[in-house]
């Protein structure tokens, strides 16, 4: 805690200037008034303050706005943002995008912090939902942002905002998220032509079942062996070797180079190798010939 | 071109008096807050005295507190240190340098090259 | 005021080498730490800032880490436009205040 002491005659700040980095930490909380700041809080930005200085400024915030700051002051906070705690920014009401942006490119550069984590979810909550325009701007500081929501929070995002989703932002997102987002991509995606709506959908692909696999190898697609070992085993699994092939076009020859990965190996292993040996790439593990294949799920499902 | 080039430096005897020049060029010199800072021999850097853009703010190291005066001409583009009561623990090279702020924090942006004063009878 | 002690005032090394600048300050500066480079009779040259972040032109061979109290500046591969004397300065607290200084020079 600073000491209350009177401001010395002739320091009283009659303004937020770069005057009051020459002031110790009692004169600025002697100094400054903190209706004053508030007022002036877009010039804090520009000034070099020192670390203490900031801190004496906030607790000055602090002190105005106990229940929380109003949103005209934290559009200005500029660097001081970064002094804030979670716990300060669970009292704000963020509404303006822009404000959100204003913040975030304060900490750009930098990893996600807990205050900007705690920003965004009350941004987010205070919205509803993840719109366009927020997904738009957190991706852009944050590439990876999508893949950090839980399935839970992916299922509040509006199909319309996967416009916004660029094929980085998707790196690092497990299955059970694109699970989430695929439906999503689809429907977003669904007015588009052939080639086109692969190139957009082609990111989202390690939620997709079967059904859409078997789908997209009819139209020519050239799936490339990345995006093919991204796929979920289970809707690898029952392509036939003419539709993996139709699938990967050119690309089927990496196959090979994949043969002991997944989904790859799991997929030979449920192939007869006499298909397998179609394909003229020397992969095998197949199921041999005059072998019966019994679907066991199948017959559970049956019984 | 950002520039700083101090003058003024030279032999002074002990209870005497200089006045050091630092012209700046290549920024808006009344923006930005200023400072002296000295490296005396062998030693490391010390601040001395600063001065906001306006010059309606100073603040001064302990160590010459009643004995320096900091001050600026805008229109010259040029700061200023008068130097009184010299001792020889004053000997040093004096530097000017600019305050900016980089991602937040604060830093000394821009120097000039030095003035050296050697305090000495 | 905080005081800033560099370690080692001075060193000897060779073109390649990788080398290592420490400074300790007497209280906590969370990570309000600058470092400067001064080549003899020139400027000194604000280097690394905020303890990490490399000002613009600086190059990538130089790094710095650390946090609280105890900071080091890092050159991977020492060139010959490296020699220099680096200083830290604490931002954290008014006044500014520098260690004092380490002299890198040819082995």
């Known amino acids: 805690e600073v000491e209350k002491t009177a401001c010395p005659s002739g320091k009283k700040a009659r303004e937020i200037d770069e005057s009051l980095i020459f002031y110790k930490k009692w004169e600025l909380e002697a100094c400054v008034d903190a209706a004053l700041l508030a007022t002036q809080m877009d010039r804090v930005n520009a000034i070099p303050f020192t670390y203490e200085q900031l801190d004496v400024l906030k607790h000055k915030l602090d002190e105005l706005y106990p229940q929380g700051y109003p949103e005209s002051v934290i559009q200005h906070l500029g660097y001081l943002f970064l002094k804030m705690s979670p716990e300060d920014i669970r009292k704000w009401n963020v509404t303006s995008l822009e404000t959100l942006k204003a913040l975030l490119e304060v900490n750009k550069g930098h990893e996600m912090s807990p205050q900007v984590a705690t920003l965004i979810d009350r941004f987010v909550k205070g919205r509803g939902q993840l719109d366009k325009d927020t997904l738009d701007t957190l991706t852009a500081f944050y590439p990876g942002y999508l893949c950090s929501l839980s399935p839970e929070e992916l299922s509040s995002v509006p199909p319309s905002s996967i416009w916004a989703v660029r094929p980085q932002d998707l790196d690092t997102c497990d299955p059970r998220q694109l699970d989430v987002l695929y439906p999503k991509a689809r429907l977003a995606f669904q007015n588009m032509n052939g080639s086109e709506y692969f190139v957009k959908i082609q990111s989202f692909l390690g939620g997709a079942p079967t059904e859409d696999l078997k789908a997209l190898s009819q139209q020519n697609v050239s799936m490339d062996l990345a995006t093919f070992m991204k796929l979920r085993t289970d809707a690898v699994l029952p392509l036939t070797v003419a539709e993996v092939q139709k699938l990967l076009g050119p690309h089927v020859e990496g196959l090979k180079a994949e043969e002991r990965h997944r989904p790859v190996r799991d997929w030979i292993l449920r192939q007869r190798q006499d298909d397998l040996d179609t394909l003229g790439l020397g992969l095998q593990g197949g199921i041999p010939n005059g072998y019966l294949v019994l679907d066991l799920s199948m017959q559970e499902a049956l019984s | 071109e950002v520039q700083l080039v101090e003058s003024g430096g030279g032999l002074v005897q002990p209870g005497g008096s200089l006045r050091l020049s630092c012209a700046a060029s290549g920024f808006t010199f009344s923006s930005y807050a200023m400072s002296w800072v000295r490296q005396a021999p062998g030693k490391g850097l010390e601040w001395v005295s600063g001065i906001s853009g306006s010059g309606g703010s100073t603040g001064y190291a302990d160590s010459v507190k009643g004995r320096f005066t900091i001050s600026r001409d805008n229109s010259k583009n040029t700061l200023y240190l008068q130097m009184n009561s010299l001792r020889a623990e004053d000997t040093a090279v004096y530097y000017c340098?600019?305050?900016?702020?980089?991602?937040?924090?604060?830093?000394?942006?821009?120097w000039g090259q030095g003035t050296l004063v050697t305090v000495s009878s | 005021d905080i005081q800033m002690t560099q370690s080692p005032s001075s060193l000897s090394a060779s073109v390649g080498d990788r080398v290592t600048i420490t400074c300790r300050a007497s209280q906590s500066i969370s990570n309000w730490l600058n470092w400067y480079q001064q080549k003899p009779g020139k400027a000194p040259k604000l280097l690394i800032y905020?303890?990490?972040r490399l000002q613009s032109g600086v190059p990538s061979r130089f790094s710095g880490s650390g946090s609280g109290t105890d900071f080091t500046l890092t050159i991977s591969s020492l060139q010959p436009e490296d020699f220099a004397t680096y200083y830290c300065q604490q931002s954290y607290s008014f006044p500014w205040t520098f260690g004092q200084g380490t002299k890198v020079e040819i082995k």
């Open positions: 905020a303890t990490s």
């Open positions: 340098a600019k305050h900016g702020q980089v991602g937040g924090i604060s830093v000394f942006d821009i």
